[in-house]
Structure formats: structure tokens, C-alpha cells
């Protein structure tokens, strides 16, 4: 369960793949599309608001009766729109929604290092946001592979400015 309904903290960042391609968002026909692309040198990177939430592991999962605390994030590139997992289509989509956000908008944060992260679906453990054919997709990961696959790793570059009002 997510502890509280408000995030413990927020940060504004640009998101890129492990291979330094940018994650960009474009409004097309009244809906947003997500692209993975090489950015022209002078083009500004798109910003994403990451909201961090605390969540308790059910004690049965921790195996010894002790709850573990994990971080979950929601990702919002523009006001009122959030990245969501579509588990049926194995896709990652941008949807306009009101709070409280649906479970599909929450991702368990895994840090490889501080700025290198992966996002695991809250609704489908073992399934991560990844890169497939220059798009974001949901990718099933075998835990024995140590979550090391580069296609599920993303780099976060924090942007320091007042980040509570983003457009």
C-alpha cells in the first residue's frame, strides 16, 4: 500500500535512455505520443515531473515478517498527464487523469546508481518500462538477469528550478 496520498518529494528531470537517446513527448491529434530519439544539439530536452511515494512491501513478500519500504514514482511530462502502463497492450501511454491516480501510473523505482534507474510496474511485478523499436514499451524481465538489461535503464538529469508548475 502507498503510504499517504501525497508524494514525499518531487523533482524535475529530463529522461534519456542508457544509450543517451531522449524521451520526448508530442501532442498529436489531442493526445500525447512518446518518442525515443536522438536530439538535435540545440533542442531543449523535455522535462518530466517525478513524484516520489513511499510504499510498504506486504510482510509476506519480505519473507521474515518485516515490512520493507520502497519508492514508487509517477511521471508527468505535462500538467494533468501521466505515464501509464497498459499491461494488455504491453505499452506505455500518456493519459489525462485526475487524482487519486490509478495504480497503472505508479512504478517501483530501482536505482542502478543515482541517475541510472529503471521503472517496474506496480500492477505487474517483473514488468518494466523499456525501449523497443524507438518507442517505450513494457518489457518482462527475468530477475535472474539482475535487472541489468540496458533497454530498461534510463538516465535522469535533474533540472533545478521551481518544478511544481510545469507545462
Amino acid at each position: 500500500s502507498i503510504t499517504g496520498i501525497s508524494p514525499i518529494t518531487e523533482s524535475l528531470a529530463s529522461l534519456s535512455t542508457y544509450n543517451d537517446q531522449s524521451i520526448t513527448f508530442a501532442l498529436e491529434d489531442e493526445s500525447y505520443e512518446i518518442y525515443v530519439e536522438d536530439l538535435k544539439k540545440d533542442k531543449k530536452k523535455d522535462k518530466v515531473l517525478l513524484s516520489y511515494y513511499e510504499s510498504q512491501h506486504p510482510s509476506s513478500e519480505s519473507g521474515d515478517g518485516v515490512d520493507g519500504k520502497m519508492l514508487m514514482v509517477t511521471l508527468s511530462p505535462t500538467k494533468d498527464f501521466w505515464l501509464q502502463a497498459n499491461n494488455k497492450e504491453h505499452s506505455v501511454e500518456l493519459h489525462k487523469c485526475e487524482k487519486p491516480l490509478p495504480d497503472q501510473a505508479f512504478f517501483v523505482l530501482h536505482n542502478r546508481s543515482f541517475n541510472c534507474v529503471s521503472f517496474e510496474c506496480k500492477t505487474d511485478p517483473g514488468v518494466f518500462i523499456g525501449v523497443k523499436d524507438n518507442h517505450l514499451a513494457l518489457i518482462k524481465v527475468d530477475y535472474s538477469e539482475n535487472l541489468g538489461s540496458e533497454n530498461i535503464l534510463f538516465k535522469l538529469s535533474e533540472i533545478l528550478e521551481h518544478h511544481h508548475h510545469h507545462h
Epitope: T9, S11, L12, Y52, G63, M70, L71, L109, S113, L160
Partner: antibody, heavy 122, light 107 residues
């Protein structure tokens, strides 16, 4: 009860080696990144090194890089620190400390051991 | 590397006083900052994480705030057990770094 217990400290000559251990209990050890932090007598806290839950990622302070090695044995709920080429300035209490969150470096160190003293002197 | 500078290095106060400790980072980050309390001869204890989140079991007289480069720990009404040394620590990038500490002493 969530607990960390360090051992292996002692008196060692400059250039010598030592292996510190930290035994964990009361939590799912493999889910958490772990750290070693030291404190020289009368001084402040200094982060030394960290290791991811799986053991696949390790990070070191410049002051110990190439001399100290962090490792873990998740099957035995144990964390280790191998100290080589020890110097007088490595004299300190060494604490092991657990990260707040599973799978994440963010947060802070929510559980600390009682510390083990390492004295480097001839 | 992010350097953390704490001030003051020591402060003399009485029971019931309001005490404010500041921590300044050499470069800005959002809010992954922690505060610890250390009593002589004991291990440090986590008080605050994510700049303002109170660790479970810590009294509400401890309050953390700030983001960017400036962070603050406030003890609203000092209690006898609060006389200790306090450290800030950035948890934003490796190497992890601590402030130099602030010793809160009895006036």
C-alpha cells in the same frame, strides 16, 4: 528486531590488512543496498563505500579507492569490508549502515551497527 | 563531488529553546538530504530523510526543510536528550557526503 552487528576491528600496523564483517538480521538483507561509514576519533562522519542489494554495484570514496573492497554474502546476511594498505588516517570507528529503501540509493541510512574500532599504528 | 557545509559548528542552548541548524550544498539538488543525531559513544540515528520526512519514532519537535542548496533542521523546543551532534548528508550522488556536524551543547 532489525539489527546490524559489526566485528573484525583491531590494532594493525601501517601497510597491513583487516577484514570487517557486519551481520544483519530482522530484514530481507538482499533487498537493500548497504554502506560502510567511518568516524575518526573526535571527528565527523565519512562515507566510505556502498554496495547494491545484489552485490553488482559498488562505489567508493576517493580516499579508499583501490585499497578497500566491499562485498556481501546474501545467503549469510553478511556484509564485508576488506581493508588493505592501511594508513594511520584510516584509524576510525567503522559502522555498517542500511539504506532506507529497497532497490534504491535515495533516502538515508535508517539502521546502523554499533561500530567496530580500527586502529592503525606501529 | 557535492560538499556539505554545516553551520554553526556548535551552539549553546537551554532546554525549551528553539534551535536551527543549516546545511549548504556546493551544488543544488532537489531534496534527497538526511539529518542524523549522534550521542557520544553511540551510532548515529536517522531523524529526517528526503529533506523533510520524519523518520518513524522521531519526535515531531524535529523538523526538516529546504531544497536546492539550502537545508535546515529545526528543533522547536529543545529537550535534555537532544544535546548531541547533528549531521546532514546528501543522498543525491556518489560519493555520499556528510556535513561537518553541529554540536548542540547545554548553555
Amino acid at each position: 528486531e532489525v539489527q546490524l552487528v559489526e566485528s573484525g576491528g583491531g590494532l594493525v600496523q601501517p601497510g597491513g590488512s583487516l577484514r570487517l564483517s557486519c551481520s544483519a538480521s530482522g530484514f530481507t538483507f538482499s533487498s537493500y543496498a548497504m554502506n560502510w561509514v567511518r568516524q575518526a576519533p573526535g571527528k565527523g562522519l565519512e562515507w566510505v563505500t556502498a554496495i547494491s542489494g545484489s552485490g553488482g554495484g559498488t562505489y567508493y570514496a576517493d580516499s579508499v579507492k583501490g585499497r578497500f573492497t566491499i562485498s556481501r554474502d546474501n545467503s549469510k546476511n553478511s556484509l564485508f569490508l576488506q581493508l588493505n594498505s592501511l594508513r594511520a588516517e584510516d584509524t576510525a570507528v567503522y559502522y555498517c549502515a542500511k539504506q532506507t529503501y529497497t532497490s534504491s540509493w535515495y533516502g538515508g541510512f535508517d539502521i546502523w551497527g554499533q561500530g567496530t574500532m580500527v586502529t592503525v599504528s606501529s | 563531488d557535492i560538499q556539505m557545509t554545516q553551520s554553526p559548528s556548535s551552539v549553546s542552548a537551554s532546554v525549551g529553546d528553539r534551535v536551527t541548524i543549516t546545511c549548504r550544498a556546493s551544488q543544488g539538488f532537489s531534496s534527497w538530504l538526511a539529518w542524523y543525531q549522534q550521542i557520544p559513544g553511540k551510532a548515529p540515528k536517522l531523524l529526517i530523510y528526503a529533506a523533510s520526512r520524519l523518520q518513524s519514532g522521531v519526535p515531531s519537535r524535529f523538523r526538516g526543510s529546504g531544497s536546492g542548496t539550502d537545508f535546515t533542521l529545526t528543533i522547536s523546543s529543545l529537550q535534555p536528550e537532544d544535546f548531541a551532534t547533528y549531521y546532514c548528508q546528501q543522498a543525491n550522488s556518489f560519493p555520499l557526503t556528510f556535513g561537518g556536524g553541529t554540536k548542540v551543547e547545554i548553555k
